[in-house]
């Protein structure tokens, strides 16, 4: 029985050239998190954080992705092409898989505000 819920930063915006933190949090379960996958909308993986093996950033994103904080992910040097959906997939035992969604909008405007609001998708 999956009792947990994923809280995410929801819909966020950030300015071109800047950076943004993608954050998910799993709550309401005692399940052990064995791995967290960070994916883009096309299911391509940006990074994973395995409980035993640590962080690994996919080669294509090495220059622009930094692990953390926590199980989150920091995207740097944002471009307009970074606009879109991002998913955190929590692999847990014994519950199974939980998935959270974040929508990032990259703005040209210098007044773009980075929303840090948490919400349940």
């Amino acid at each position: 029985m999956m009792t947990g819920t994923i809280e995410t930063t929801g819909n966020i915006s950030a300015k071109k050239g800047g950076s943004v933190i993608l954050q998910c949090h799993l709550s309401s379960t005692m399940a052990q998190v064995t791995q967290v996958n960070w994916e883009q909308h096309d299911h391509s993986l940006l990074a994973i954080r395995n409980a035993e093996l640590g962080w690994h950033i996919y080669p294509a994103f090495k220059d622009r992705v930094a692990p953390g904080p926590g199980l989150g992910l920091t995207l740097q040097s944002l471009t307009m092409n970074d606009t879109g959906e991002y998913f955190c997939t929590y692999h847990t035992y014994p519950d199974g898989t939980y998935r959270g969604r974040i929508f990032l909008e990259v703005l040209e405007s210098s007044v773009a505000e980075h929303s840090a609001r948490f919400q349940i998708p």
Epitope: T34, E52, G54, P59, Y93
Partner: antibody
Framework: EVQLQQSGPELVKPGASVKMSCKAS????????MDWVKQSRGASFEWIGR????????SYNQKFKGKATLTVDKSSSTAYMELNSLTSEDSAVYYC????????????WGAGTTVTVSS | QIVLTQSPAIMSASPGEKVTMTCSAS?????MHWYQQKSGTSPKRWIY???KLASGVPTRFSGSGSGTSYSLTISSMEAEDAASYFC?????????FGAGTKLELK
Amino acid sequence: EVQLQQSGPELVKPGASVKMSCKASGFTFTDYFMDWVKQSRGASFEWIGRLNPNNGRTSYNQKFKGKATLTVDKSSSTAYMELNSLTSEDSAVYYCARGDLGRWYFDVWGAGTTVTVSS
Amino acid sequence: QIVLTQSPAIMSASPGEKVTMTCSASSSVSYMHWYQQKSGTSPKRWIYDTSKLASGVPTRFSGSGSGTSYSLTISSMEAEDAASYFCQQWSSNSLTFGAGTKLELK
């Protein structure tokens, strides 16, 4: 060409240890995980464990904890597996394989190292 | 740990025949991967992420499934397809393989 070159066959006595190697070429070694898989004669596969070459951290199948030790030499792009306290049950072909990070499949396999345990 | 049961264990097919083999998981899994192995050689990644064909795999192969039930299908058997096929999954605490389906040419 992406390749995993494994060391040659081993004939060892019961109770002994053996260390085999897997040299990677044709790709950036630290961009992937390295896995080890056992195939007993005429049987299926058992996953032994996985190594993160960047930090040397490992993840093992519970069954092989204490039996297998995975290590790495980043400078030579080589992964190693040592098996200890060998018995006839350890006679098998051992493969190293390049592991996908997120989905945990193996996209490149070595040719295998045959280990025979016999007195 | 999740047990993968492949069926049939052995099967034979004539050239041009449609072939389907299955892999049943003891608990739900997110993805299934398949490998082809010919006698005396190392396995080759064949289908990954349930339905994606590895580079060089003929398009007569396909993979499908979800939850606990997955399958590999060959739309029209060819001689070079004779081999053993193994399914594999990773879930949060285990990576396991099926015992394999040996496909022979009739």
